[in-house]
């Protein structure tokens, strides 16, 4: 039968190349079973998990799987880095891969770079 | 079960380009991986890239940096690869290959591509 | 990039030996999970290569049990407890730890 554990659905080494000045919605997919978890996102600071406390949060509800998005409006430069999302459950707490934003300052409409050259030149991030 | 089948081989002037296509079937191709790997006539495996289906991020080798282009149609579950300004030191077998995302509990690779660069 | 190295580069083998091949990374492979993103590969003339083993020692399914896998931080082994005819291969260990992954140069396992 289905484990009623919940799972955190963040592919390993995710990333994703996103522009300054947009809006952006980053997923954390979690499956359960009954009462939902609570759910928190953090951002890494070496080796640290740094809880955002202060940011936008909602849910998605669909009908296999929930989602506790973290809302960037807009994105900004410093959003740049690795986050994580974490549940606790039954008093154990369950971590998510990492998943990466590669953010891209904003340039004038024409100058700005198409989705697979950002995907191609994340070092010009850091 | 998870199955990769790739497109036919090709025959290629230098300096044009090829794009292998390879379709998936027997998973969600937004809950994986797709790579690519080649290997020329004799020698080992050489990692081209990857992209993450689910939104289109590809990663290249450096070697590979600029010439090759990796894409994903969801709608399809087919990725490509397509490598520009070809020259002899391309011919080989290029293979794609898909994993888990999550736990890498499966990894599959297609049948290959024999891709010959000649004039 | 991360180096992997395997030895040997060829290895002659008769049926029922235990066959061992190494691999060694440049760097090591243990990610922040706290897990290690070593695999291993056969594949045989004319064909797709296959995986076998993930994650250092988890064989994939299908794959019969004589083969394992051991190690940790840069250096593994692929160990073949009992050759049978068909385990006559080329096989390789790479890294999924870091980009861009790396490959061995692969050991090819003859008949003696």
């Known amino acids: 039968k289905e484990s009623c554990d919940v799972q955190l659905y963040i592919k390993r080494q995710s990333e994703h190349s996103i522009l300054a000045g947009d809006p952006f919605e980053l997923e954390c997919p979690v499956k359960y079973c009954a009462n939902r978890p609570h759910v928190t996102w953090c951002k890494l600071n070496g080796t640290t998990c740094v809880k955002l406390e202060d940011r936008q949060t909602s849910w998605k509800e669909e009908k296999n799987i929930s989602f506790f998005i973290l809302h960037f409006e807009p994105v900004l430069p410093n959003d740049n880095g690795s986050y994580r999302c974490s549940a606790n459950f039954q008093s154990n707490l369950i971590e998510s891969h990492s998943t990466t934003l590669y953010v891209t300052d904003v340039k004038s409409a024409s100058e700005r770079p198409s989705k697979d050259e950002m995907a191609s030149r994340p070092w010009l991030l850091y | 079960q998870v199955q990769l089948v790739q497109s036919g081989a090709e025959v290629k002037k230098p300096g044009s380009s090829v794009k292998v296509s390879c379709k998936a079937s027997?998973?969600?191709?937004?809950?994986?991986?797709m790579y690519w790997v080649r290997q020329a006539p004799g020698q080992g495996l050489e990692w081209i890239g990857r992209?993450?289906?689910?939104?289109?991020?590809?990663r290249y080798a450096q070697k590979f940096q600029g010439r090759a282009t990796i894409t994903a149609d969801e709608s399809t579950s087919t990725a490509y690869m397509e490598l520009s300004s070809l020259r002899s030191e391309d011919t080989a077998v290029y293979y794609c290959?898909?994993?888990?995302?999550?736990?890498?509990?499966?990894?599959?690779w297609g049948q290959g591509t024999l891709v010959t660069v000649s004039s | 990039d991360i180096q992997m190295t395997q030895s040997p580069s060829s290895l002659s083998a008769s049926v029922g030996d235990r066959v061992t091949i190494t691999c060694r990374s440049s760097?090591?492979?243990?990610?922040?999970?706290?897990?290690?993103?070593l695999n291993w590969l056969q594949q045989k003339p004319g064909k797709a290569p296959k995986r076998l083993i993930y994650?250092?020692?988890k064989l994939d399914s299908g794959v019969p049990s004589r083969f394992s896998g051991s190690g940790s931080g840069t250096d593994f082994t692929l160990t073949i407890s009992s050759l049978q005819p068909e385990d006559f291969a080329t096989y390789y260990c790479?890294?999924?730890?870091?980009?861009?992954?790396?490959f061995g140069q692969g050991t090819k396992l003859e008949i003696k």
């Open positions: 290959a898909v994993y888990d995302g999550y736990y890498e509990s499966f990894d599959v």
């Open positions: 027997g998973v969600n191709i937004k809950d994986t991986y």
């Open positions: 992209i993450d289906p689910a939104n289109g991020y590809a």
């Open positions: 760097q090591s492979l243990l990610d922040s999970d706290g897990k290690s993103y």
């Open positions: 994650l250092v020692s």
């Open positions: 790479w890294q999924g730890t870091l980009f861009p992954r790396t």
